[in-house]
Each structure stands twice: as structure tokens, then as C-alpha cells.
């Protein structure tokens, strides 16, 4: 149950994760199974640990094994195990079924296929894409963040994808391949102009001085799953992370729900210790897709809080 | 928010097993990190911390009670349910369920509580 | 068992003035360099509140007045200025080794 298979390719980075899980504040050790000894945490070390991750910068044949994480709460040990498996690379071009990631289904209308195991590491886009080894060009493809879009696939889109990107660790770069195979299915799904659920159009929150408030921007876009939707706050028409101001962040992340099968996302905004000069903001939650832009405006007002005292 | 609610019977016999629900909603038992853990207060006393188990179900109890102790969860239902056996009139108290998160380990939501007694 | 003893069992403050109440561990609740000690207000009725966790730091929505400090095996919880609704009980709390223990409790009254 807690053991995970891991693969790489000679002489390419490969970065594992624990299969079990903890809190930031439990600590991680991690060791070579068959002797039990301590793998290093330095990072001047080939093969060394960094908290729930196991870095082979760059893996060899050699390493290949279990290896054992434990992570350390205050009060009981989880004990997991990577299977870790390092081959040699191919002289041609085929792809071994042992090297591939799960396979992934796409739709004229939803044709995402992301690069496996990618958010393990230090990269900068763009990715590069290949499809059976030859390196993907035209209009039709188009690298976003950590997947490839492919604008109206057809039958012939089917096959095995690679992704290739660099891994960055202290100035060093390393090279990192991942293949998985991808199909085509017909989807009844549509995607629609973006509908803000929530908040109201020229809606008024009150809230308190000095308190925490939450704003939460929800969007519905369509049926099925779709891509490049987006929800997100601006402040004073201005995007979060360069208003500069820390005591309001976006949450990390949008959570797609589907209700009543549509496809929705939302994304909170966490306004920590509210002073006054939030009053005189104008907030915006935007929602975005291919079709367009539609956008809600929120002003923030205070709410006398009631006095509790005796 | 983070809510959680006791829920199970307020008289139990000596002898008799007491089976408390603790059924809660803000969160995921599923998530990992997360906690619920079960605290009992008797009348005008200190709180004694029982058991509490955790996100990938590993339980833990008070080494003092653990023969008798067994706690359970059900993710879907967003529930966690702790039996205790052989009832004595001492365990009469207020048993709290509540959540365990942060960074660290500790209780930062708890639910308001349930009454026991125990009494033939 | 980590044995929580608090100190005093019980005081009564002027409104405006600092209460300090302290807590000390039978042995260290150090890990990692943290101190995995809490303190909880509970009001008659009701159930534990967190107002400190990990020794110093004031939970959210809690006022500035409680503050929390120490380290080891010795931590003080202290309310400044203290004002007529602290009325309650305080409890100290670990979680470095199971079971997790309670202080037996301070009762702070209003002079």
C-alpha cells in the first residue's frame, strides 16, 4: 500500500516522493533498504534527500533499488518505499512499455495532456513535445505551462507523447523525459462564455477591522472537462502577486467542481488583518476561457462588530 | 468552516459499551495532514485526551484506556465513531470530538460536547 | 506520561492588570526544534477554545492581550490587559509524546 514504483533514464535527473504523506513540520530520513544506511541530505552528493523527496542529480544504473522514507511526527513513524528503477537509454526511437506513464484520453474538445511527474521539479518553460520522437511543430500545438494543448485532434493525434524539460538545482542543469501514450475519444461537452456564480455583480461585504475575510470568485464554463478556463482576482485592476501587498494573497490552486455537471472553478481571496485602506479598494473576480472575459466588482465595507463584553 | 458535532447516548449501564459518532464538515479525513481526536471531561475535573486517528488511518490511543478504546472513520460520511467497553459510573463526562490541524499537531476545533452518564 | 502541572490553581486579577499562568512539563516537549505545548480557554458550558499553539503563537481571531511563552519544559500563558470576560479556566496541553496530556487547569476569577 505504501511503496511506489519510480523510473528513470541514465544520466537524466530523477526526483521521488514519499509515499507517505505528512505535515511540513514532520521530518523525512531517508535509506538505502538493502543496508539501511542513511542516505545524505547535502546536496554536493549525487543521490541525496530533501524532505519528502529522494534527488538522483543525475541518475545511474547503479541506483536502481528500494529505497525506505520515514517520516517523523512527533508521536509515531510512517514508513514508506520507492521502488526506483534506472535504465539505460535507447538507441532508437521506440519507447519500452516500462519507461511509459498512464495513458491519457482526449476529445476535440479537451486535448490536455500533461507531462508526468513535472511538479517534482525545478523547471522553466517551455516544455519541448515530441510525438514518437519527432519534435512537435505548427500552430496546432501549443505548449501551456506543464501540457500540451493540440487544437482540434483528430484520430491521427493518437500516440506516444514525450515531454523533455530541464531540471534546475543550484545552477546545475539537468535533462528530464517522461512518455505517456495518448488516445482519442468522442466527448459530448461544450464549453460557454464564463458565468459568475458568486460574487454579485457590485456586491458590498462587510467586514471587520482587524479581522480575516475571505472572498471566494466562482465560475462555471461549460460541460466536460475544460481547458485554459480560469478564475482569479484583481485588485484594483491590478493582478495579486504584483499589487504587493502579503496580507492578501489568492489561494493556491483552483478547485474545479462540477455541479450539476458543469464545470466550475473557484478561487479565494484571503484578506488577513483588515485595515482600512482595503475599504478604498476595488476588487475583481475574473473569469476567463477561450470564449472570453466577464468580470464582477467587489467593494468592502465595515461591519461594526458587536460588543461581546460584560 | 471547520464544524464538528457529538452525537450518541446521553445514560449507559455499567458494563454497557458506549459508541460515540463524531460527524464533522469544513474538512477532508482524506487530506493529508488531517486529524480528529476524541477528549472527555468529567464533571469539574481536567480534560483527558482518549484517542484520535489520522488521515491515512493510523489510530493512536491513551495507553491507560487502549484495551478498551477503538476509533473509526468513514471518509464519506465524514465521520469518526469511538466505542468504549465496560462502562464504570467514572467515566461519567462531557466527550468532546475534535479536530486536529496546522502545521503541527494539535487541537484547533472542537465540537461542543456530549454528555455521558454512566448509572444503572 | 508527560505530567503537566500549572500554577496557580486558581487567581483573581483586577480588570486591567496582567495574569500570568504558567505550566511545567515533567520532561521536554521539544521536537525539531519547536515546543508543542497549547493553551485553551473554556468558559462554563463550553468547550475548549485554542488561544496558543506551539508555546507563542496566538491563533487567529484571538485578541493580542494572550500571549504565550517559553520553552522546554517551562511555558507561561499571559493575559495583558486582562478584562471582565477572561473569566474562565486555562488549560496547558502537549503533543510531543502520546498520550497527550492536560494541565489540571487555571481558574482565573475577576477581583
Known amino acids: 500500500k505504501f511503496s511506489k514504483q519510480s523510473w528513470g533514464l541514465e544520466n537524466e535527473a530523477l526526483i521521488v516522493r514519499c509515499p507517505r504523506q505528512g505535515k511540513p513540520s514532520y521530518t523525512v530520513d531517508w535509506y538505502y533498504s538493502q543496508t539501511n544506511k542513511s542516505i545524505p541530505t547535502q546536496e554536493r552528493n549525487r543521490v541525496f534527500a530533501s524532505g519528502q523527496l529522494l534527488k538522483f542529480l543525475p541518475a545511474a544504473v547503479a541506483d536502481s533499488g528500494i529505497y525506505t522514507c520515514i517520516v517523523r511526527s512527533p508521536t509515531f513513524n510512517r514508513t514508506g518505499y520507492a521502488n526506483v528503477t534506472i535504465y539505460k537509454k535507447q538507441s532508437d526511437c521506440n519507447v519500452p512499455d516500462y519507461l511509459m506513464y498512464s495513458t491519457v484520453s482526449g476529445s476535440e474538445k479537451n486535448s490536455k495532456i500533461y507531462c508526468p511527474t513535472i511538479d517534482l521539479y525545478n523547471w522553466t518553460a517551455p516544455l519541448e513535445w515530441f510525438k514518437n520522437c519527432q519534435a512537435l511543430q505548427g500552430s496546432r500545438y501549443r505548449a501551456h505551462k506543464s501540457f500540451l494543448v493540440i487544437d482540434n485532434v483528430m484520430t491521427e493525434d493518437a500516440g506516444d507523447y514525450t515531454c523533455k524539460f530541464i531540471h534546475n538545482e543550484n545552477g546545475a542543469n539537468y535533462s528530464v523525459t517522461a512518455t505517456r501514450s495518448f488516445t482519442v475519444k468522442d466527448e459530448q461537452g461544450f464549453s460557454l462564455f464564463p458565468v459568475i456564480g458568486a460574487p454579485a455583480q457590485n456586491e458590498i461585504k462587510e467586514v471587520e477591522i482587524g479581522k480575516n475575510a475571505n472572498l471566494t470568485c466562482s465560475a462555471c464554463f461549460g460541460k466536460g472537462t475544460q481547458f485554459l478556463a480560469a478564475v482569479l482576482w484583481q485588485l484594483n485592476g491590478t493582478k495579486i502577486t504584483d499589487f504587493g501587498e502579503p496580507r492578501i494573497q489568492q489561494e493556491e490552486g483552483q478547485n474545479q467542481s462540477f455541479s450539476n455537471g458543469l464545470a466550475c472553478l473557484d478561487m479565494v481571496l484571503r484578506i488577513a488583518d483588515v485595515k482600512e485602506e482595503d475599504l478604498l479598494l476595488q476588487y475583481d473576480c475574473l473569469a476567463l476561457n477561450l470564449h472570453g472575459l466577464r468580470r464582477h466588482t467587489v467593494r468592502l465595507s465595515r461591519k461594526n462588530p458587536i460588543d461581546h463584553h460584560s | 468552516q471547520v464544524t464538528l458535532k457529538e452525537s450518541g447516548p446521553t445514560l449507559v449501564k455499567p458494563t454497557q459499551t458506549l459508541t460515540l459518532t463524531c460527524t464533522f464538515s469544513?474538512?477532508?479525513?482524506?487530506?493529508?495532514?488531517?486529524?480528529v481526536g476524541w477528549i472527555r471531561q468529567p464533571p469539574g475535573k481536567a480534560l483527558e485526551w482518549l484517542a484520535h486517528i489520522w488521515w491515512d488511518d493510523v489510530k493512536q490511543y491513551n495507553p491507560a484506556l487502549k484495551s478498551r478504546l477503538t476509533i473509526t472513520k468513514d471518509t464519506s460520511k465524514n465521520q469518526v465513531v469511538l466505542t468504549m467497553t465496560n462502562m464504570d459510573p467514572v467515566d461519567t463526562a462531557t466527550y468532546y470530538c475534535?479536530?486536529?490541524?496546522?502545521?503541527?499537531?494539535?487541537?484547533?476545533?472542537w465540537g461542543q460536547g456530549t454528555t455521558v452518564t454512566v448509572s444503572s | 506520561d508527560i505530567v503537566l502541572t500549572q500554577s496557580p490553581a486558581s487567581l483573581a486579577v483586577s480588570p486591567g492588570q496582567r495574569a500570568t499562568i504558567t505550566c511545567r512539563a515533567s520532561?521536554?516537549?521539544?521536537?525539531?526544534?519547536?515546543?508543542?505545548m497549547q493553551w485553551y480557554q473554556q468558559k462554563p458550558g463550553q468547550p475548549p477554545k485554542l488561544l496558543i499553539y506551539?508555546?507563542?503563537n496566538v491563533e487567529s481571531g484571538v485578541p493580542a492581550r494572550f500571549s504565550g511563552s517559553g520553552s522546554g519544559t517551562d511555558f507561561t500563558l499571559t493575559i495583558n490587559p486582562v478584562e471582565a470576560n477572561d473569566i474562565a479556566n486555562y488549560f496547558c496541553q502537549q503533543s510531543r509524546k502520546v498520550p497527550w496530556t492536560f494541565g489540571q487547569g487555571t481558574k482565573l476569577e475577576i477581583k
Open positions: 506551539v508555546a507563542s
Open positions: 520532561e521536554s516537549v521539544e521536537y525539531s526544534g519547536t515546543s508543542l
Open positions: 475534535a479536530h486536529i490541524g496546522g502545521d503541527y499537531d494539535y487541537f484547533d476545533f
Open positions: 469544513g474538512f477532508s479525513l482524506s487530506t493529508s495532514g488531517m486529524g
